[in-house]
């Protein structure tokens, strides 16, 4: 007979993920030497226990703890870079400017950056077929509790001057919805954080409006000072160009804005 | 069907070193991770470390470290238990054993097992 | 490490005997427990995974129970082949752990 198995609304477990996990863990120790204690055998096993056997809607963060704790790791605090809707530049300008780190630089964020996974309640097994989706579905998945976890600790890490780049090209440049506006937002720590510095990326060539006046903008400078912490903001007309002075900073052309 | 075939007994002295061998067929080695557990006269079972073939990557258990070395061979499906520094008291069964590499389940195959007696 | 606790550690039963053999984790370990036979010179059998899970091809008289803490393997009628030795093993974290084994031996 059988066995009756839930139809979620999201596109299932990414396929070969606990060996894509594992796999990751070990690149990201090899290449990083303050993470070569971490045993990958037991991040996976971890891993695996914040979902396996548990129902995909019923997931908490109290079930990532154990991960939480074996994938601890120190990044210099004041040299964080938030993003919201703008994640493949953000990765490309941490990997130049390679002092600077988002979430996906650290060990938790890398493990789980573009996967999808989800387990059933009460079976040992991996749900391959589909997992549920934040909206149709449910919030409380594993996918989104993770991201919730981790990015909520990743901001109360953060320090002095916080860096957050946003996109232009959209809507709503900041989205209270996201994961920066509903949690990073509002983790920051006002005793350690100075300064929130907005980078917003033009979309356009030719678009020369300050977007630092959007309204979205101003909602998110009246969040950050009400939490008194200073706010300022930067337009970044030219990510190209911007990308190639953060290169090749004593390029002349990198005097004028960018 | 699968098959865990282990190399043959062995008498060693103390001091020295032992590298116990297990050939895995019927199934892709890769696709696994293998387990070693021994098993002194009369007592019970003792898990030492695990291999993932496709990772290359081992880890065992505190009490071994610094003794233990894990490998595995894709090109032979085979993996590798070398234990050294040997005393008296790692005079035991040793068995390789199979388990996914998502560790979801049990040790589905074993190892006939490998008889290592330290004695001077 | 997750220390595992069997117990009995011995018991004598007839054949067509209800057995119970119960396993302690000192600390949670969810579902995350296998149950294996071992017959003299002979390499342990899975029997159940997942506390409740019965390995393929195992008899439906044996049965597992349990999660977090305490678990228990239950042999509903006891037959000649299943006099032999019964371990519990942990698959949460590092390092495995194996309860002592419990013999069940011809009363």
């Known amino acids: 007979v059988p066995r009756w198995r839930q139809q979620w609304s999201g596109p299932g477990t990414t396929k070969r993920f606990p060996e894509t996990v594992l796999a990751r863990c070990v690149k990201y120790t090899e290449i990083h030497p303050e993470m070569r204690h971490v045993d990958c055998q037991s991040v996976w096993d971890a891993f695996k226990g914040a979902f396996i056997s548990k129902h995909p809607c019923n997931i908490t963060e109290e079930d990532y703890q154990p991960l939480m704790k074996l994938g601890t790791q120190t990044v210099p605090c004041n040299k964080i870079l938030l993003w919201s809707r703008i994640k493949d530049l953000a990765h490309q300008f941490t990997q130049v400017q390679r002092d600077m780190f988002t979430l996906e630089d650290t060990l938790l964020g890398y493990l789980a950056d573009d996967l999808t996974w989800c387990g059933e309640f009460n079976t040992s097994k991996i749900n391959y077929q589909s997992c549920p989706d934040w909206r149709k579905d449910c919030s409380n998945n594993p996918v989104s509790v993770f991201w919730k976890t981790v990015s909520r600790r990743f901001a109360e890490a953060a320090c002095d001057v916080v860096h957050v780049m946003l996109n232009g090209s959209r809507s709503k440049i900041f989205d209270k919805n996201s994961t920066f506006g509903s949690v990073e937002v509002h983790n920051l720590q006002p005793e350690k954080v100075q300064t929130l510095e907005a980078w917003v990326i033009h979309g356009g060539r030719e678009d020369s409006r300050d977007l630092c006046q959007d309204p979205t903008i101003k909602e998110l400078e009246s969040i950050i000072s009400k939490r008194n912490i200073q706010f300022s903001c930067k337009n970044i007309y030219r990510p190209d160009k911007f990308l190639q002075c953060v290169k090749n900073p004593e390029d002349s052309s990198c005097t004028s804005e960018i | 069907q699968v098959q865990l075939v282990q190399s043959g007994a062995e008498v060693k002295k103390p001091g020295s070193s032992v590298k116990v061998s297990c050939k895995a067929s019927?199934?892709?080695?890769?696709?696994?991770?293998f387990s070693w557990v021994r098993q002194a006269p009369g007592q019970g079972l003792e898990w030492m470390g695990r291999?993932?073939?496709?990772?290359?990557?081992?880890n065992s258990a505190q009490k071994f470290q610094g003794r233990v070395t894990i490998t595995a061979d894709k090109s032979t499906s085979t993996a590798y238990m070398e234990l050294s520094s040997l005393r008296s008291e790692d005079t035991a069964v040793y068995y390789c054993?199979?388990?996914?590499?998502?560790?979801?389940?049990?040790?589905?195959?074993w190892g006939q097992g490998t008889l290592v007696t330290v004695s001077s | 490490d997750i220390q595992m606790t069997q117990s009995p550690s011995s018991l004598s039963a007839s054949v067509g005997d209800r057995v119970t053999i119960t396993c302690r984790a000192s600390?949670?370990?969810?579902?995350?427990l296998a149950w294996y036979q071992q017959k003299p010179e002979k390499a342990p059998k899975s029997l159940i995974y997942?506390?409740?899970s019965l390995q393929s091809g195992v008899p439906s008289r044996f049965s597992g129970s349990g999660s977090g803490t305490d678990f228990t393997l239950t042999i509903s009628s006891l037959q000649p082949e299943d006099f032999a030795t019964y371990y519990c093993?942990?698959?949460?974290?590092?390092?495995?752990?194996f309860g002592q084994g419990t013999k069940v031996e011809i009363k």
């Open positions: 291999v993932i073939p496709f990772l290359g990557t081992a």
């Open positions: 019927g199934g892709t080695f890769s696709s696994y991770a």
């Open positions: 093993q942990q698959y949460n974290s590092y390092p495995r752990t």
């Open positions: 600390q949670g370990i969810s579902s995350w």
């Open positions: 997942a506390a409740s």
């Open positions: 054993a199979r388990d996914d590499i998502a560790a979801l389940g049990p040790f589905d195959y």
